[in-house]
Protein backbone atom coordinates (compact mmCIF):
# COMPACT_ATOMS: atom_id res chain seq x y z
CA UNK A 1 0.00 0.00 0.00
CA UNK A 2 1.27 3.48 -1.01
CA UNK A 3 1.97 5.99 2.11
CA UNK A 4 0.39 8.92 2.05
CA UNK A 5 2.70 11.95 2.57
CA UNK A 6 1.51 14.57 4.55
CA UNK A 7 2.70 17.80 4.95
CA UNK A 8 1.99 20.10 8.27
CA UNK A 9 2.95 23.71 6.81
CA UNK A 10 4.46 25.09 4.02
CA UNK A 11 7.66 24.26 5.11
CA UNK A 12 7.44 20.55 5.28
CA UNK A 13 5.88 21.00 1.57
CA UNK A 14 8.90 23.26 0.52
CA UNK A 15 11.31 21.25 2.14
CA UNK A 16 9.67 18.18 0.35
CA UNK A 17 10.75 19.87 -2.70
CA UNK A 18 7.65 21.52 -4.13
CA UNK A 19 9.05 24.97 -4.43
CA UNK A 20 6.53 26.90 -6.49
CA UNK A 21 3.88 29.39 -5.33
CA UNK A 22 0.00 27.79 -4.84
CA UNK A 23 -2.55 25.66 -2.71
CA UNK A 24 -1.28 22.81 -1.38
CA UNK A 25 -3.28 20.65 1.51
CA UNK A 26 -2.11 20.37 5.07
CA UNK A 27 -2.85 18.07 7.54
CA UNK A 28 -1.61 18.02 10.96
CA UNK A 29 -0.03 15.36 13.00
CA UNK A 30 -2.44 12.62 14.38
CA UNK A 31 -5.08 14.67 12.19
CA UNK A 32 -7.08 13.41 9.20
CA UNK A 33 -8.40 17.11 9.05
CA UNK A 34 -7.12 18.75 5.72
CA UNK A 35 -6.74 23.05 5.00
CA UNK A 36 -5.87 23.94 1.77
CA UNK A 37 -3.56 26.87 2.24
CA UNK A 38 -1.62 29.61 0.12
CA UNK A 39 1.99 28.30 0.41
CA UNK A 40 4.12 31.96 -0.50
CA UNK A 41 7.67 29.55 -2.01
CA UNK A 42 9.43 32.69 -3.09
CA UNK A 43 9.45 35.36 -0.47
CA UNK A 44 12.40 35.39 1.97
CA UNK A 45 13.26 31.82 1.38
CA UNK A 46 9.92 30.43 0.67
CA UNK A 47 8.21 27.56 3.25
CA UNK A 48 5.37 30.89 4.30
CA UNK A 49 2.13 29.63 5.14
CA UNK A 50 -0.36 32.45 4.29
CA UNK A 51 -3.12 32.40 7.26
CA UNK A 52 -4.46 36.06 6.28
CA UNK A 53 -4.71 37.68 2.93
CA UNK A 54 -6.85 40.42 1.56
CA UNK A 55 -6.22 42.31 -1.63
CA UNK A 56 -9.61 43.50 -3.62
CA UNK A 57 -12.73 43.47 -0.94
CA UNK A 58 -14.09 39.86 -3.29
CA UNK A 59 -14.53 38.42 0.51
CA UNK A 60 -16.83 39.56 3.10
CA UNK A 61 -14.82 39.41 7.06
CA UNK A 62 -17.19 40.06 9.08
CA UNK A 63 -18.09 36.88 10.37
CA UNK A 64 -19.12 34.49 13.13
CA UNK A 65 -16.75 32.97 15.69
CA UNK A 66 -16.79 29.39 13.96
CA UNK A 67 -16.20 30.94 10.79
CA UNK A 68 -13.39 32.30 12.25
CA UNK A 69 -11.87 29.28 13.87
CA UNK A 70 -12.86 26.96 10.66
CA UNK A 71 -11.62 29.52 7.93
CA UNK A 72 -13.03 31.33 5.08
CA UNK A 73 -12.67 32.53 1.74
CA UNK A 74 -10.45 31.35 -1.06
CA UNK A 75 -6.72 30.63 -0.66
CA UNK A 76 -5.78 32.17 -4.05
CA UNK A 77 -7.37 34.98 -3.12
CA UNK A 78 -8.82 36.52 -0.01
CA UNK A 79 -8.97 33.93 3.12
CA UNK A 80 -8.75 33.69 6.70
CA UNK A 81 -6.98 30.19 7.16
CA UNK A 82 -8.46 29.51 10.48
CA UNK A 83 -7.97 29.74 13.97
CA UNK A 84 -8.06 26.10 15.22
CA UNK A 85 -5.46 25.16 13.14
CA UNK A 86 -2.86 27.70 13.48
CA UNK A 87 -3.08 27.66 17.16
CA UNK A 88 -2.98 24.02 17.09
CA UNK A 89 -0.02 24.42 14.65
CA UNK A 90 1.93 27.12 16.61
CA UNK A 91 1.50 24.90 19.50
CA UNK A 92 3.67 22.05 18.20
CA UNK A 93 6.41 24.25 17.28
CA UNK A 94 7.90 27.57 17.23
CA UNK A 95 6.70 29.83 14.74
CA UNK A 96 7.57 33.60 13.38
CA UNK A 97 4.41 35.72 12.17
CA UNK A 98 5.22 38.05 9.41
CA UNK A 99 2.71 40.67 7.94
CA UNK A 100 3.05 42.29 5.01
CA UNK A 101 1.56 45.20 3.98
CA UNK A 102 0.90 47.68 0.72
CA UNK A 103 -0.53 51.07 0.84
CA UNK A 104 -2.38 52.84 -2.00
CA UNK A 105 0.35 54.63 -3.20
CA UNK A 106 2.93 51.99 -3.99
CA UNK A 107 4.43 51.37 -0.80
CA UNK A 108 4.92 47.96 1.06
CA UNK A 109 6.24 47.44 4.73
CA UNK A 110 6.46 44.54 7.07
CA UNK A 111 6.63 43.38 10.64
CA UNK A 112 8.39 40.41 11.72
CA UNK A 113 7.52 39.03 15.01
CA UNK A 114 10.12 36.03 16.15
CA UNK A 115 8.33 34.37 18.16
CA UNK A 116 3.92 33.66 17.49
CA UNK A 117 1.11 31.63 18.87
CA UNK A 118 -2.49 31.70 19.57
CA UNK A 119 -3.77 29.78 22.59
CA UNK A 120 -6.24 27.21 22.12
CA UNK A 121 -9.94 28.15 22.01
CA UNK A 122 -10.77 27.71 25.42
CA UNK A 123 -8.54 30.88 25.97
CA UNK A 124 -10.24 32.58 23.22
CA UNK A 125 -7.36 32.08 20.38
CA UNK A 126 -5.50 34.75 22.35
CA UNK A 127 -2.10 36.12 20.66
CA UNK A 128 1.62 35.98 22.19
CA UNK A 129 3.95 37.44 20.22
CA UNK A 130 7.82 38.18 20.52
CA UNK A 131 10.40 40.05 19.49
CA UNK A 132 9.49 42.65 16.76
CA UNK A 133 11.45 44.00 13.84
CA UNK A 134 10.50 45.18 10.45
CA UNK A 135 9.55 48.40 8.55
CA UNK A 136 5.78 48.94 8.98
CA UNK A 137 6.49 50.95 12.55
CA UNK A 138 8.28 50.19 16.20
CA UNK A 139 5.91 49.92 17.89
CA UNK A 140 3.64 46.69 17.44
CA UNK A 141 0.25 47.38 16.05
CA UNK A 142 -0.91 44.27 17.74
CA UNK A 143 -1.29 45.68 21.29
CA UNK A 144 1.00 43.73 23.80
CA UNK A 145 0.76 41.59 25.84
CA UNK A 146 -1.59 40.12 23.44
CA UNK A 147 -5.62 39.70 24.12
CA UNK A 148 -8.01 37.59 23.28
CA UNK A 149 -9.84 36.93 19.64
CA UNK A 150 -13.40 38.92 18.74
CA UNK A 151 -15.85 38.69 16.38
CA UNK A 152 -19.14 40.20 16.22
CA UNK A 153 -20.81 37.34 17.94
CA UNK A 154 -17.65 37.03 20.27
CA UNK A 155 -16.76 39.68 22.32
CA UNK A 156 -13.72 39.35 23.89
CA UNK A 157 -11.83 42.40 24.14
CA UNK A 158 -11.10 45.20 26.57
CA UNK A 159 -13.16 47.73 25.68
CA UNK A 160 -16.95 48.04 27.02
CA UNK A 161 -18.58 48.69 23.53
CA UNK A 162 -18.16 45.86 21.21
CA UNK A 163 -14.94 46.41 19.23
CA UNK A 164 -16.10 43.90 16.27
CA UNK A 165 -19.27 45.40 15.91
CA UNK A 166 -17.62 48.57 15.68
CA UNK A 167 -15.30 48.03 13.86
CA UNK A 168 -15.93 44.87 12.05
CA UNK A 169 -14.20 42.38 11.40
CA UNK A 170 -12.36 39.54 13.74
CA UNK A 171 -9.33 40.50 15.38
CA UNK A 172 -7.07 40.71 18.06
CA UNK A 173 -9.22 43.30 20.17
CA UNK A 174 -7.96 45.54 22.63
CA UNK A 175 -9.91 48.68 23.80
CA UNK A 176 -9.82 48.71 20.30
CA UNK A 177 -6.16 49.28 19.76
CA UNK A 178 -4.16 50.38 16.83
CA UNK A 179 -4.94 47.65 14.21
CA UNK A 180 -7.19 45.57 12.54
CA UNK A 181 -6.21 43.85 9.28
CA UNK A 182 -9.82 42.26 9.08
CA UNK A 183 -11.82 45.54 8.51
CA UNK A 184 -13.86 46.98 5.88
CA UNK A 185 -11.89 46.56 2.42
CA UNK A 186 -11.95 50.51 1.23
CA UNK A 187 -10.95 50.93 -2.59
CA UNK A 188 -8.72 53.94 -3.50
CA UNK A 189 -9.91 57.06 -2.74
CA UNK A 190 -12.21 56.07 -0.25
CA UNK A 191 -9.33 54.93 2.10
CA UNK A 192 -8.82 57.82 4.29
CA UNK A 193 -10.55 58.77 7.59
CA UNK A 194 -12.16 55.61 7.95
CA UNK A 195 -12.08 54.12 11.66
CA UNK A 196 -13.54 50.57 10.47
CA UNK A 197 -11.09 50.11 7.61
CA UNK A 198 -7.94 47.87 7.04
CA UNK A 199 -5.60 49.40 9.99
CA UNK A 200 -1.81 48.98 10.83
CA UNK A 201 -1.99 52.38 13.00
CA UNK A 202 2.14 52.05 13.87
CA UNK A 203 2.78 52.30 9.79
CA UNK A 204 0.08 54.55 8.42
CA UNK A 205 -1.83 55.99 11.29
CA UNK A 206 -5.53 55.70 12.45
CA UNK A 207 -8.05 56.61 9.73
CA UNK A 208 -5.68 55.04 7.02
CA UNK A 209 -7.18 52.02 4.85
CA UNK A 210 -4.96 49.57 3.21
CA UNK A 211 -4.65 48.09 -0.17
CA UNK A 212 -3.17 44.55 0.63
CA UNK A 213 -1.79 42.43 3.41
CA UNK A 214 -0.69 38.96 4.26
CA UNK A 215 -0.04 37.29 7.43
CA UNK A 216 2.68 34.53 7.08
CA UNK A 217 4.08 32.10 9.30
CA UNK A 218 7.21 30.06 9.16
CA UNK A 219 9.07 27.73 11.49
CA UNK A 220 11.72 29.81 13.32
CA UNK A 221 14.30 27.17 12.49
CA UNK A 222 13.19 26.86 8.70
CA UNK B 1 -18.51 23.51 33.94
CA UNK B 2 -16.90 27.10 35.61
CA UNK B 3 -18.37 28.00 38.51
CA UNK B 4 -18.73 31.15 40.07
CA UNK B 5 -20.34 32.54 43.11
CA UNK B 6 -20.54 36.33 44.18
CA UNK B 7 -20.82 37.37 48.15
CA UNK B 8 -20.24 41.52 49.53
CA UNK B 9 -23.82 42.71 48.43
CA UNK B 10 -25.89 44.38 50.99
CA UNK B 11 -28.33 47.51 51.83
CA UNK B 12 -25.66 50.73 52.30
CA UNK B 13 -26.43 54.57 52.14
CA UNK B 14 -25.53 56.37 49.44
CA UNK B 15 -21.96 57.53 49.69
CA UNK B 16 -21.03 54.44 51.37
CA UNK B 17 -18.81 51.30 49.99
CA UNK B 18 -18.61 47.85 49.37
CA UNK B 19 -16.05 45.39 48.27
CA UNK B 20 -17.72 42.57 46.02
CA UNK B 21 -16.41 39.17 45.69
CA UNK B 22 -16.57 36.99 42.99
CA UNK B 23 -14.59 33.26 43.46
CA UNK B 24 -13.84 30.79 40.78
CA UNK B 25 -13.33 27.41 40.41
CA UNK B 26 -14.02 24.33 38.32
CA UNK B 27 -12.15 25.50 35.10
CA UNK B 28 -10.64 22.47 32.78
CA UNK B 29 -7.50 20.44 33.49
CA UNK B 30 -4.77 22.68 32.36
CA UNK B 31 -5.99 25.79 33.08
CA UNK B 32 -6.25 28.18 35.91
CA UNK B 33 -8.35 31.22 36.97
CA UNK B 34 -5.48 33.20 35.95
CA UNK B 35 -5.37 32.25 32.24
CA UNK B 36 -8.99 34.19 32.16
CA UNK B 37 -9.98 37.90 31.40
CA UNK B 38 -13.32 38.72 33.89
CA UNK B 39 -15.81 40.55 33.50
CA UNK B 40 -18.26 42.36 36.24
CA UNK B 41 -21.84 43.15 35.28
CA UNK B 42 -25.09 44.64 36.55
CA UNK B 43 -28.44 44.25 36.30
CA UNK B 44 -31.10 46.65 37.78
CA UNK B 45 -35.10 45.67 37.91
CA UNK B 46 -36.21 47.11 34.23
CA UNK B 47 -33.31 47.47 32.46
CA UNK B 48 -30.39 45.90 30.21
CA UNK B 49 -27.65 44.11 31.56
CA UNK B 50 -24.76 46.89 31.80
CA UNK B 51 -21.38 46.03 31.95
CA UNK B 52 -19.26 47.57 34.89
CA UNK B 53 -15.88 46.49 34.32
CA UNK B 54 -12.97 44.44 32.93
CA UNK B 55 -10.10 42.61 33.90
CA UNK B 56 -7.22 41.34 32.61
CA UNK B 57 -5.91 37.87 32.88
CA UNK B 58 -2.59 39.24 34.84
CA UNK B 59 -4.68 41.74 35.87
CA UNK B 60 -2.66 44.93 34.94
CA UNK B 61 -5.62 45.89 32.10
CA UNK B 62 -8.47 47.41 33.27
CA UNK B 63 -11.14 49.09 32.10
CA UNK B 64 -14.46 50.95 33.32
CA UNK B 65 -17.93 51.73 32.25
CA UNK B 66 -17.99 55.80 32.06
CA UNK B 67 -20.64 55.48 34.81
CA UNK B 68 -18.60 53.71 37.86
CA UNK B 69 -15.17 55.51 36.34
CA UNK B 70 -13.13 57.10 39.32
CA UNK B 71 -15.53 55.36 41.89
CA UNK B 72 -15.23 51.32 41.29
CA UNK B 73 -11.70 49.71 41.28
CA UNK B 74 -11.91 46.36 39.74
CA UNK B 75 -8.69 43.90 41.12
CA UNK B 76 -8.19 39.97 41.35
CA UNK B 77 -5.92 37.50 43.47
CA UNK B 78 -4.99 34.55 40.95
CA UNK B 79 -3.48 32.86 44.10
CA UNK B 80 -7.07 32.67 45.93
CA UNK B 81 -9.00 32.67 42.34
CA UNK B 82 -10.89 35.51 43.45
CA UNK B 83 -12.06 38.48 41.49
CA UNK B 84 -13.29 42.18 43.39
CA UNK B 85 -14.95 45.20 42.97
CA UNK B 86 -14.57 47.73 45.55
CA UNK B 87 -17.27 49.67 44.82
CA UNK B 88 -16.80 53.75 46.60
CA UNK B 89 -18.84 56.45 46.81
CA UNK B 90 -22.37 54.74 46.22
CA UNK B 91 -25.13 56.18 44.31
CA UNK B 92 -28.73 55.01 44.16
CA UNK B 93 -28.23 54.57 40.52
CA UNK B 94 -25.47 51.47 41.11
CA UNK B 95 -28.47 49.32 42.71
CA UNK B 96 -28.20 46.27 40.83
CA UNK B 97 -27.73 42.53 40.94
CA UNK B 98 -23.87 42.33 40.62
CA UNK B 99 -22.58 39.24 38.28
CA UNK B 100 -19.34 38.02 37.51
CA UNK B 101 -18.61 36.35 34.04
CA UNK B 102 -16.07 34.96 32.32
CA UNK B 103 -15.80 33.89 28.40
CA UNK B 104 -14.64 30.67 27.32
CA UNK B 105 -14.37 29.56 23.64
CA UNK B 106 -17.63 31.90 22.85
CA UNK B 107 -19.46 30.95 25.55
CA UNK B 108 -20.45 32.55 28.77
CA UNK B 109 -20.16 31.15 32.21
CA UNK B 110 -22.15 33.57 34.85
CA UNK B 111 -22.86 33.57 38.69
CA UNK B 112 -26.34 34.32 40.34
CA UNK B 113 -25.12 37.55 41.49
CA UNK B 114 -24.99 39.86 44.80
CA UNK B 115 -27.81 41.88 45.41
CA UNK B 116 -26.34 45.70 46.06
CA UNK B 117 -29.04 48.43 47.30
CA UNK B 118 -27.89 52.15 47.61
CA UNK B 119 -31.08 53.67 49.65
CA UNK B 120 -31.37 56.69 52.20
Known amino acids: KEEQISFRDCAEVFKSGHTTNGVYTLTLPNSTEEVKAYCDMEAGGGGWTIIQRREDGSVDFQRTWKEYKVGFGNPSGEYWLGNEFVSQLTNQQRYVLKIHLKDWEGNEAYSLYEHFYLSSEELNYRIHLKGLTGTAGKISSISQPGNDFSTKDADNDKCICKCSQMLTGGWWFDACGPSNLNGMYYPQRQNTNKFNGIKWYYWKGSGYSLKGTTMMIRPADF | EVQLVESGGGLVQPGESLRLSCVAS????????????MYWYRQAPGKERELVAI????????TYADSVKGRFTISRDNAKNTMFLQMNSLKPEDTAVYVC?????????WGQGTQVTVSS
Open chain 2, 55 to 62: ISNDGLRK
Open chain 2, 101 to 109: NVRRANRDD
Open chain 2, 26 to 37: GFPSGFTFSDYQ
